[in-house]
Amino acid sequence: QTSVSPSKVILPRGGSVLVTCSTSCDQPKLLGIETPLPKKELLLPGNNRKVYELSNVQEDSQPMCYSNCPDGQSTAKTFLTVYWTPERVELAPLPSWQPVGKNLTLRCQVEGGAPRANLTVVLLRGEKELKREPAVGEPAEVTTTVLVRRDHHGANFSCRTELDLRPQGLELFENTSAPYQLQTFVLPATPPQLVSPRVLEVDTQGTVVCSLDGLFPVSEAQVHLALGDQRLNPTVTYGNDSFSAKASVSVTAEDEGTQRLTCAVILGNQSQETLQTVTIYSFPAPNVILTKPEVSEGTEVTVKCEAHPRAKVTLNGVPAQPLGPRAQLLLKATPEDNGRSFSCSATLEVAGQLIHKNQTRELRVLYGPRLDERDCPGNWTWPENSQQTPMCQAWGNPLPELKCLKDGTFPLPIGESVTVTRDLEGTYLCRARSTQGEVTRKVTVNVLSPRYE
């Protein structure tokens, strides 16, 4: 009778085991083991027992002990079960960003592992079990579907294998996949709102604002603002589920023409974009040209207004004839024209908008001097001892210097308050002098003596 010990063994893959083959007869003709495994017989006392070290056990095996005794030949098998944890436990790759409301399929693949009867695959969200199934097939595959919710944001999904050898007196061996961290998001179907000037003048700055509501998580939203090839650098302000991106845009002559202004919002693996056209224009103020900015009275003056070739101008409210970018007027300079403003207004249509620019020039007319009766009366009669202010205004451009002298020496205090005395009486010669020449006028002061009663 042949016996084997142990009759059942569970051992790690690649491990070794000692198997004892025994026979009930004292002097067996033959005692041995039949196995494809590498084996070593060990030293033992006696003849009816042999111990074999079986090594590098890679798969389940059934070594067979045999003995040949006088009463016949017999055999006994031992059952070697190899255990090993899976070589690969992997969640199928998924985009890390998933839109809320989408059905997400988690697929776990398990390669290897034995004994399969003791191997279970578990899909988890955090520590919560989503699905538990025995490992079947090679590779074993377990799938489950998850409806993506907002509160799943940042959740870790993983796959775990459990090789439960506790019934065999061993432990529970666990292998866990690398976690998949889910990033959930909501990007509304509405495009972002873009507020910007439709037209922008060269060498000026404009403000662009892009905003969008109903985002989750708003802090993860990327905003890209660009005008043509120029990336704008916005300042982004976040609300609970909204953002507003504000940027300054500067344009130069190189940008002139129609440019595309884009605002793109990227969240997760989706994007929403708004496009707008901005017309960059160059429109210098019109040019007002006077023949000479300073002329003498009676001189003929030409006033010209020139503007952008596509502009329409009016000069002092009078439209150009024909309507266009140039206008002019002719005048003979009079004193009344001194300080007169000539205003040119140019209007340019850019992308359906009317842009207005103005330029004003002032004409200086040199005239005089003049001394008129109205401004410098020839006769004054004042009571003696009364308070009076002699007035004499000389006119001209430049303003003339005025002196009124009696007998060439005694001055009349023009514009000053004086007490009228007998000395003030007489005829004064008022002389107004400027670069334009001089004029004189006689002024007589009469002093009335008080009546003595």
């Epitope: 084996k39 070593k40 017989e41 060990l42 030293l43 033992l44 006392p45 006696g46 042999k50 111990v51």
Partner: antibody, heavy 121, light 106 residues
């Protein structure tokens, strides 16, 4: 460290019984798997294995000398004793005791210095 | 009983590789050990469990065992390796030594 030392008579008369003692230190014969054995070497000849006793008191003997040999142990004294009956001049040899760290694998990792036993009348 | 057969002598030039064989019926199914013995000294274990080297034994000593032959290999043999070498195995319930090989370093 592990040490073994053989002791016994240097001269034995033919037909007498030889008693050799192996005293060891640095290990215990009550440790699972451990054994102590005896080997002899006649002058100018090869090593010849004689006997072995293990921690479990299992005894192993050379088939050709089995009837003349007895091996025993005194675990408390850390000693192993070998007796060989009916000594003959051909039994003249250096007798060694050695430790088997894993008896079932049969190798001897530490040897005593040996004791020369001459059998002569 | 198993018998272990070794060549009586092997010669090798210093620095060369020496190989000493030990043959026995189905020897590869059992563990083999090797001992070095210098004149007047006790044997020293140099290889056990076919190919394992005890601590303190130089790396130039290596062993193998398969089929009916165990082999002790000394790579880059040195003058101090000149000695008698014994193989050892077992045939339950007894232990067996080979007849020994004298290694001469030329």
């Amino acid at each position: 460290q592990v040490q073994l030392k053989e002791s016994g008579p240097a001269l034995v008369k033919p037909t007498q019984t030889l008693t050799l003692t192996c005293t060891f230190s640095g290990f215990s014969l009550s440790t699972s798997g451990v054994g102590v054995g005896w080997i002899r070497q006649p002058p100018g000849k090869a090593l010849e294995w004689l006997a072995l006793i293990d921690w479990d008191d299992d005894k192993y003997y050379s088939t050709s000398l089995k009837t003349r040999l007895t091996i025993s142990k005194d675990t408390s004294k850390n000693q192993v004793v070998l007796t060989m009956t009916n000594m003959d001049p051909v039994d003249t040899a250096t007798y060694y005791c050695a430790r088997y760290p894993v008896t079932q694998r049969s190798y001897m990792d530490v040897w005593g210095q040996g004791t020369l036993v001459t059998v002569s009348s | 009983d198993i018998e272990l057969t070794q060549p009586p002598s092997v010669s090798v030039a210093p620095g060369q590789t020496a190989r000493i064989s030990c043959s026995g019926d189905a020897l590869g199914d059992k563990y083999a050990s090797w001992y070095q013995q210098k004149p007047g000294q006790a044997p020293v274990l140099v290889i056990y469990d076919d190919s394992d080297r005890p601590s303190g034994i130089p790396e130039r000593f290596s062993g193998s065992n398969s089929g009916n032959t165990a082999t002790l290999t000394i790579s880059g043999t040195q003058a101090e390796d000149e000695a008698d070498y014994y193989c050892q195995s077992y045939d339950s319930p007894q232990v067996v030594f080979g007849g020994g090989t004298k290694l001469t370093v030329l």
